[in-house]
């Protein structure tokens, strides 16, 4: 579904320097869907259109990234650009729907982290070690503290998984790597199940 990424990039490259700056500021305050994290301000403000497109896609995936870009552009009064994205969204929506059939076959090829969400929530006990491995590189300070503030291991893991929808493959791989180091037998068990 690379079309969505290309469409976001086209839209952002059509913005003037001031408009791109305004887009970033609005992105810092726009209401996000439950479970999605915010791109860190420091990194965001330094990005050009290409970097920002990559960041939007890695944080929010293509579908929601496209929707979010449309929302911000509308907030800025740039209806025309938003409409162009709407067209792309509708076209790529049909492609996405076709690609997701049959669901059974794709479910098994999902990332380990997504496949075994329930088991990981139930069985990971050393959550602090996992959090430490993800601090900064995957989890912001606020996310890290929010997970650690939960009282039980299950609640901590549930909170951690609430951030997963905004993660890219690298982030999920980092979590898997941390789990392999801290709970090697659990990972082996789940991989064989």
């Amino acid at each position: 579904m690379g079309r969505a990424r290309d469409a976001i990039l086209d839209a952002l490259e059509n913005l003037s320097g001031d408009e791109l700056k305004k887009f970033k500021m609005k992105l810092l305050t726009v209401q996000l869907r439950e479970g999605y994290g915010r791109i860190p301000r420091g990194a965001l403000l330094q990005m050009d259109a290409i970097d920002l497109t990559d960041k939007l896609v890695s944080y929010y995936l293509e579908s929601y990234g496209l929707e979010l870009t449309m929302t911000v552009l509308r907030d800025m009064g740039l209806q025309e650009l938003a409409e162009q994205l709407q067209t792309t969204k509708e076209e790529s929506g049909a492609v996405a729907a076709a690609a997701s059939v049959p669901a059974q076959s794709t479910a098994r090829t999902g990332h380990f982290v997504d496949q075994h969400r329930q088991a990981l929530i139930a069985r990971v006990t050393e959550v602090d070690g996992v959090l430490d491995a993800l601090h900064g590189s995957v989890l912001t300070e606020g996310q890290y503290q929010a997970v650690r503030a939960e009282t039980t291991s299950q609640d901590k893991m549930r909170k951690l998984f609430s951030f997963v929808p905004s993660w890219n493959l690298t982030c999920k791989d980092s979590l898997l790597q941390a789990l392999k180091e801290i709970h090697p037998y659990l990972v082996m068990d789940l991989e064989q199940s």
Partner: antibody, heavy 118, light 111 residues
Framework: EVQLQQSGAELVRPGSSVKMSCKTS????????ITWVKQRPGQGLEWIGY????????EYNEKFKDKAALTSDTSSSTAYMQLTSLTSDDSTIYFC???????????WGQGTTLSVSS | DIVLTQSPASSAVSLGQRATISCRAS??????????MHWYQQKPGQPPKLLIK???TLESGVPARFSGSGSGTDFTLNIHPVEEEDTATYYC?????????FGGGTKLEIK
Amino acid sequence: EVQLQQSGAELVRPGSSVKMSCKTSGYTFTNYGITWVKQRPGQGLEWIGYIYVGNGYTEYNEKFKDKAALTSDTSSSTAYMQLTSLTSDDSTIYFCARIAQGRCFDYWGQGTTLSVSS
Amino acid sequence: DIVLTQSPASSAVSLGQRATISCRASQSVSTSSYSYMHWYQQKPGQPPKLLIKYASTLESGVPARFSGSGSGTDFTLNIHPVEEEDTATYYCQHSWELPYMFGGGTKLEIK
């Protein structure tokens, strides 16, 4: 062997800015964060802030938010700290260090001495 | 901010004896799994060197005469038996929350 090599001593005028560097080697730069620490002569250590160079994520000690700006260049495996609106109070030694798991600092640079004088 | 109070400020210990340095945090820096307290040694003209992380885990290459203990708010660094090369200033550091803070330091002298 992990090494952090900091730039040389700086002598600058009050009110000006300075950008010091911390060149790393011996490990994958983007897998770790870099933190910066201030130490006045004969005194303790003060945490300034950190940058996770893989994603540019930064956090600062509130005290240094308007003083320090942390950046990095992955192509040269180098972290930078820019200090602005310099005063004599900024004259001291600054260390960079690598952030290990648990946010302890396992490898340190040799320090950069900053002198602010008119 | 969490304040770390080290004691004593300075200490003179005879060669071969035990040196004990204390670090007290103004609030707990421990979970059920880990204590986010670390210890460093700094010699004059040199950067600090990590000795112990997570309150009690000895860093690779650090002699076994160094040990750390404690949880919650009270932590201790022990050196036994002390050697001449242990003359230095020792700092504790927490990484529980921002801002990360260091203790005021303990200057250790070997008699």
